[in-house]
């Protein structure tokens, strides 16, 4: 099949003891091979500070996955989700202020 770029969506959980869990979800992409990582200041976070979901079929012939990490409240601007898929790449910020999600479809 032809390449289908991922839809990337970044969400924040409620604050807990000064921390926020940020989750980056990639969905509706093909083929299944993808790189998804959280970055701080443009640098990929350590493997053991991130949690990854499996790359799973989403029922439409495409795939979905996610990566999450915990960050300090107030430092959201330092963190971005980085995605590579089929030669394309993109960065996705943590939503600021009262906004709780951000999504973008790559072309």
């Amino acid at each position: 099949g032809s390449t289908v770029p991922p839809m990337v969506n970044v969400t924040c959980s409620e604050v807990s003891e000064g921390n926020i869990t940020v989750t980056c979800r990639a969905s509706s992409f093909y083929p299944r091979n993808i790189t998804l990582t959280w970055r701080q200041d443009g640098v990929s976070l350590s493997h053991n500070t991130q949690q990854w979901g499996d790359v799973l079929p989403d029922g439409n012939g495409t795939y979905q996955t996610w990566v999450a990490t915990r960050i300090r409240q107030g430092e959201e601007q330092r963190f971005t989700c980085y995605m590579e898929h089929s030669g394309n790449h993109g960065t996705h910020p943590v939503p600021s202020g009262n906004s709780h999600h951000h999504h973008h479809h790559h072309h």
Epitope: D41, G42, V43, H47
Partner: antibody, heavy 116, light 107 residues
């Protein structure tokens, strides 16, 4: 992307070492982390710290009490200040860009000797 | 800090030889392992990042592999321009640390 270090080649003990990294071909406010690394005589490399594209800094804990990294966004430069230097700080100092997993562009380095 | 042990510290090989340099971490670094080349004039270049990804513009004779604590850099057909010192770097656990270097010379 090009990086070029500059600064005095000789610093006296107990004084401060100040170096400049001039970046061309990419804005230091665009993305990534902008680093200082040093190489001692004998080739050992040590990461000193970085200033991120947002202006946030992260330092090697072994040097944190003596180091400061700042920037001038109008000139697309970032700076290293290392205080209370001793002869053990004699090294070649490099600046480099850290993109995602690795430092993909480095300056040519500038040699600094600490001696009275 | 994570300690990175590189072997050998120096080697001499003939043009066209296959050369392998090893790097061992004292704990799992989850593929966050990079290789750099430093020419005799001091210039440093990234060769391989994230264990096996080749940096743009790097000749295909360079390759990287490994997992867990053990990693390697291979030069498939040694050329004169490969005379240099090679360093590994782990980026999984702050602060990032480097191996002691391997000096490669031509017989």
């Amino acid at each position: 992307v090009q990086l070029q270090e500059s600064g005095p080649g000789l610093v006296k003990p107990s004084q401060s070492l100040s170096l400049t990294c001039n970046v061309t071909g990419y804005s230091i406010t665009g993305d990534y982390a902008w680093n200082w690394i040093r190489q001692f005589p004998g080739n050992k490399l040590e990461w000193i710290g970085y200033i991120g594209y947002t202006g946030s800094t992260t330092y090697n804990p072994s040097l944190k009490s003596r180091v400061s990294i700042t920037r001038d966004t109008s000139k697309n430069q970032f700076f290293l200040q290392l205080n209370s230097v001793t002869p053990e700080d004699t090294a070649t100092y490099y600046c480099a860009r850290w993109r995602n997993w690795a430092m993909d562009y480095w300056g040519l380095g500038t040699s600094v000797t600490v001696s009275s | 800090d994570i300690q990175m042990t590189q072997t050998p510290s120096s080697l001499s090989a003939s043009l066209g030889d296959r050369v392998t340099i090893s790097c061992r971490a004292n704990q799992d670094i989850s593929h966050y392992l990079n290789w750099y080349q430093q020419k005799p004039d001091g210039a440093v270049k990234l060769l391989i990042y994230y264990t096996s990804r080749i940096h743009s513009g790097v000749p295909s004779r360079f390759s990287g592999s490994g997992s867990g604590t053990d990693y390697s850099l291979t030069i498939a057909n040694l050329e004169q321009e490969d005379v240099a010192t090679y360093f590994c770097q782990q980026g999984n656990t702050p602060p990032t640390t480097f191996g002691g270097g391997t000096k490669v010379e031509i017989k």
